[in-house]
Interface confidence: low
């Protein structure tokens, strides 16, 4: 029974997480909330950091400044994918939320 | 409210080169694309090349590489473009033109700054 | 690189009419993953410089009056403007950024 209610988390927050792409950046709230996810976890993107390139708002060549390894203004434009974070956060905070819930 | 100031009008001699700039204000300088686009009445409107100044990452249209050079200053938040090996057909108006990233059609135009190549 | 086609090249019409003009891209600026159309419209008066007026080639930029409307998807896109006024005086271009970027050659619009 556990391992069912740690898949339906999993699932859940894949879904909530993706669902949250798609309102970044228009809502500030939803916005301020994947970045310090990004930027706490280190991971960028649901499954990886290209998921942001099919997100309406983001421009091809872009992803959050919280995806960079060093997060400053604009670090996320043109990026370099050495200074960003390629692992994705579904996979990431799902390891912890996997050992904590 | 975001202003793009450009540079004033060039009168520039075949085979030489000129440097033009776009003083940003009214936004974060780094956190916008800057695009160049020139205008002639035959051509119409050109997409030249653009600049990411937080990390001065270029991308230029091929019909423009080793024409335009496009450089960017973050401590006053100017972009410059340099045109190269000048001819009577580079002599037009050229945009700098800021683009928000978060859609990334061209949002903010300077007033342009004309250049004629004539002997 | 993405061709760009807009017509009519001008066209006349009395303030209070309606207007359509047409841009055909050469293939389609849908991105197909996000169901969004990349082309924008732009609106350039006499002396002046270009200005944005409609992206995602409906979304109406904030401050743009609401007689201005972008539609159509793929390849096939309008510029509607439903009550011309004197103001509209312009030459109208629409722009892919689909792929790189390019722009049409224009559509003048003068008033009657």
């Known amino acids: 029974a556990g391992y069912v209610f740690r898949d339906k988390v999993m699932s859940e927050f894949n879904n909530n997480f993706r669902q949250q792409m798609e309102n970044y950046p228009k809502n500030n709230h939803t916005a301020s909330i994947l970045d310090r996810m990004q930027a706490d976890f280190k991971c960028c993107g649901a499954a990886n950091y290209t998921d942001w390139e099919k997100i309406p708002s983001m421009s091809k060549n872009r992803v959050p400044d919280s995806c960079c390894i060093n997060v400053t203004v604009g670090c996320g434009i043109n990026f370099n994918e050495k200074a960003i974070h390629k692992e994705g956060c579904v996979e990431k905070i799902g390891g912890w939320l996997r050992k904590n819930v | 409210e975001v202003q793009l100031q450009q540079s004033g009008p060039e009168l520039v001699k075949p085979g030489a080169s000129v440097k033009m700039s776009c003083k940003a204000s009214g936004y974060t300088f780094t956190s916008y694309v800057m695009h160049w686009v020139r205008q002639t009445p035959g051509q119409g409107l050109e997409w030249i090349g653009y600049i990411t100044p937080y990390n001065d990452g270029t991308k230029y249209n091929e019909k423009f590489k080793g024409k335009a050079t496009l450089t960017s200053d973050k401590s006053s938040s100017t972009a410059y473009m340099e045109l190269s090996s000048l001819t009577s057909e580079d002599s037009a108006v050229y945009y700098c033109?800021?683009?928000?990233?978060?859609?990334?059609?061209?949002?903010?135009w300077g007033q342009g700054t004309s250049v004629t190549v004539s002997a | 690189n993405i061709m760009v086609t807009q017509s009519p090249s001008s066209l006349a019409v009395s303030a209070g009419e309606k207007v359509t003009m047409s841009c055909k891209s050469s293939?389609?600026?849908?991105?197909?993953?996000?169901?969004?159309?990349?082309l924008a419209w732009y609106q350039q008066k006499p002396g002046q410089s270009p200005k944005l007026l409609i992206y995602?080639?409906?979304t109406r930029v904030s401050g743009v009056p609401d007689r201005f409307t972008g539609s159509g998807s793929g390849t096939d896109f309008t510029l509607t403007i439903s009550r011309v006024q004197a103001e509209d005086l312009a030459v109208y271009y629409c722009h892919q950024y689909f792929s790189s970027f390019t722009f049409g050659s224009g559509t003048k619009l003068e008033i009657k």
């Open positions: 293939q389609s600026v849908l991105y197909s993953s996000h169901q969004k159309n990349y």
């Open positions: 995602w080639a409906s």
């Open positions: 033109v800021g683009g928000d990233n978060y859609y990334y059609a061209m949002d903010y």
